[in-house]
C-alpha cells in the first residue's frame, strides 16, 4: 500500500462538490487576463483571413500553497474534488493555468491559396475560459 | 501526453495511487478503496510549450510567440507542467446524513499533462 502522503488536491466541502464542475475555485492571485492580438502579429495572416484579430485570454498570477478558508478539511460527506490545486504533492508547485477541458476553439476563415478560395475552420484550444491553480 | 519513465525530466504524467485508507477517508468512502489519481511533473522548456499533441498547443504557441521575443507581459510568464485532460470517477460514499450516495466526481483522474 502507498505510504501516507498528502492528498494531491485540496479537499473540498460537500457544497463545493454540488456546483458546476467547470466553475474554478476562486484564488486570490490567479486570474484571467485579456489581450487583443492580431493574426498579423502572430504571422498567421496568410492562413487566417478573418477575423483580423481576437481577444486572447491567458492565466496569470501566483499560486500559494495555502488552503483558502472556504475549503474545509475532509469530513464525512465531503468527497475530494480538485476544485483547487491538482498537483499538491511534496515538491510540486501549483501553477496558474487554464482549467482542463474548458478551453474553447476560435472559428476562423482561412485560405491556403492566397485568397482565391476560403474555408471555415476552428482553431482548437485557443480561448481560455477559466483559470485555476493546478 | 508523456508518461514519466524516470529517464526524462520533461513534463509528464506520474503514476500516483491514492489509498483512501492511508489518508483516513475510508470511514466514509465505501468504494473504491483507492485509485490512480496521478499528477504532472517535469520541466517546460520554451521549445516544449505548444508542441502538437498537447491540448493546449495553439494557446501555448501564441504565448510562446511573444515569450521568445521578450514581449511584455509574456516575458516573465512561466510555462508549467499541468493537467490538460482530467477524467471523472464514480464513487460510493456516505453523505453527512449517512445516506449512501453514488456520484461521478469530476476531475478525479489526471489523464494527460502538458505545458501551459
Amino acid at each position: 500500500s502507498t505510504p501516507l502522503m498528502s492528498w494531491p488536491w485540496s479537499p473540498s466541502a460537500l457544497r463545493l462538490l454540488q456546483r458546476p464542475p467547470e466553475e474554478p475555485a476562486a484564488h486570490a492571485n490567479c486570474h484571467r487576463v485579456a489581450l487583443n492580438i492580431s493574426f498579423q502579429e502572430l504571422g498567421w495572416e496568410r492562413w487566417i483571413v478573418y477575423p483580423p484579430s481576437f481577444i486572447f485570454h491567458y492565466c496569470h498570477g501566483g499560486c500559494g500553497l495555502h488552503i483558502p478558508p472556504n475549503l474545509s478539511l475532509p469530513v464525512p460527506g465531503a468527497p475530494p474534488t480538485p476544485a483547487q490545486p491538482y498537483s499538491l504533492l511534496p515538491g510540486a508547485q501549483p501553477c496558474c493555468a487554464a482549467l482542463p477541458g474548458t478551453m474553447r476553439p476560435l472559428h476562423v476563415r482561412t485560405t491556403s491559396d492566397g485568397g482565391y478560395s476560403f474555408k471555415y475552420e476552428t482553431v482548437p484550444n485557443l480561448l481560455t475560459q477559466h483559470c485555476a491553480c493546478i | 501526453g508523456l508518461e514519466c519513465d524516470g529517464k526524462v525530466n520533461i513534463c509528464c504524467k506520474k503514476q500516483f495511487f491514492v489509498s483512501f485508507k492511508d489518508i483516513g477517508w475510508n470511514d466514509w468512502i465505501i468504494a473504491p478503496s483507492g485509485y490512480h489519481a496521478n499528477y504532472c511533473e517535469g520541466e517546460c522548456p520554451s521549445h516544449i510549450a505548444g508542441t502538437s499533441g498537447s491540448s493546449l498547443s495553439f494557446h501555448s504557441t501564441v504565448i510562446n510567440h511573444y515569450r521568445m521575443r521578450g514581449h511584455s507581459p509574456f516575458a516573465n510568464l512561466k510555462s508549467c507542467c499541468v493537467p490538460t485532460k482530467l477524467r471523472p470517477m464514480s464513487m460510493l460514499y456516505y453523505d453527512d446524513g449517512q445516506n449512501i450516495i453514488k456520484k461521478d466526481i469530476q476531475n478525479m483522474i489526471v489523464e494527460e499533462c502538458g505545458c501551459s
Epitope: - | 483512501f20 485508507k21 475510508n26 468512502i29 465505501i30 468504494a31 473504491p32 478503496s33 483507492g34 464514480s90 464513487m91 460510493l92 449512501i100 450516495i101 453514488k102
Partner: antibody
Framework: QVQLVQSGAEVKKPGASVKVSCKVS????????ISWVRQAPGKGLEWMGG????????IYAQKFQGRVTMTEDTSTDTAYMELSSLKSEDTAVYYC???????????WGLGTAVTVSS | DIQMTQSPSSVSASVGDRVTITCRAS??????LAWYQQKPGKAPKLLIY???KLETGVPSRFSGSGSGTDFTLTISSLQPEDFANYYC?????????FGGGTKVEIK
Amino acid sequence: QVQLVQSGAEVKKPGASVKVSCKVSGYTFTSSAISWVRQAPGKGLEWMGGIYPGSGHTIYAQKFQGRVTMTEDTSTDTAYMELSSLKSEDTAVYYCAREGDIFVMDVWGLGTAVTVSS
Amino acid sequence: DIQMTQSPSSVSASVGDRVTITCRASMDIRNDLAWYQQKPGKAPKLLIYDASKLETGVPSRFSGSGSGTDFTLTISSLQPEDFANYYCQQAKSFPPTFGGGTKVEIK
C-alpha cells in the same frame, strides 16, 4: 480466470439462520465488492447488499437490514452472507457476484439453493 | 428506490428474428444501466453495461441503447442459444434495482 465458488445447497427450518460462502479466485479480493443477489423460484432478481473488502464497508437493502450480515475473510479470499430468522419466503437461490464497477455485477457464482421448510 | 419496468414480460420469436426489449426507469438514471442474460438453472451473465457498452466476449448481435429513463436491448439476429430471460438493472443509485425480466421463447 475470475471465479466465484459458492457453498452447497441448504435446507433450513423457519426461524433458523443460513450462512452461504463465496470463495473468489483470479483477481485481488480486496479490489472489488461482492454483491449478494437472490432469486425466488420463478421470480426475478433481488439485490440484498454488498461487501467492500477494500474498505471494510457493508451496505444492505432496507428490506434485509437487521436480518442479513455480510462478512469477509481476506486470508481465504472468501465472502459470507448470513440470513437469520428464516421464513418460507426466503426459499431462493442466493448468488454472489463481483462488482466490476459500482453496482455492475460482471462475474457471478453458480448460486446456492436455500430451502426453508418446516 | 428506483423502479425498473421491463416490457414485454415475454416475447415469442424465431431464429434470425430481430428482438427488442425495453426497460423504463422511474427516474433519470443517465446511462447507468446494465443488461443480464439468464438461462434456466444458470447464473445471470452480464451482457451490457453503461447502457450501450458490450461486455467482453458477448456477441455483437447484442446491443444496448438509450439514456435517461428509456432503454432498449436489441438482439439483431436471434440465435438458438439466445432463448433465455433478460433483466435490466439500474446502477445509478443505492440500492441497485432490477427489472422484472423478459422471457425470450421459441415461437
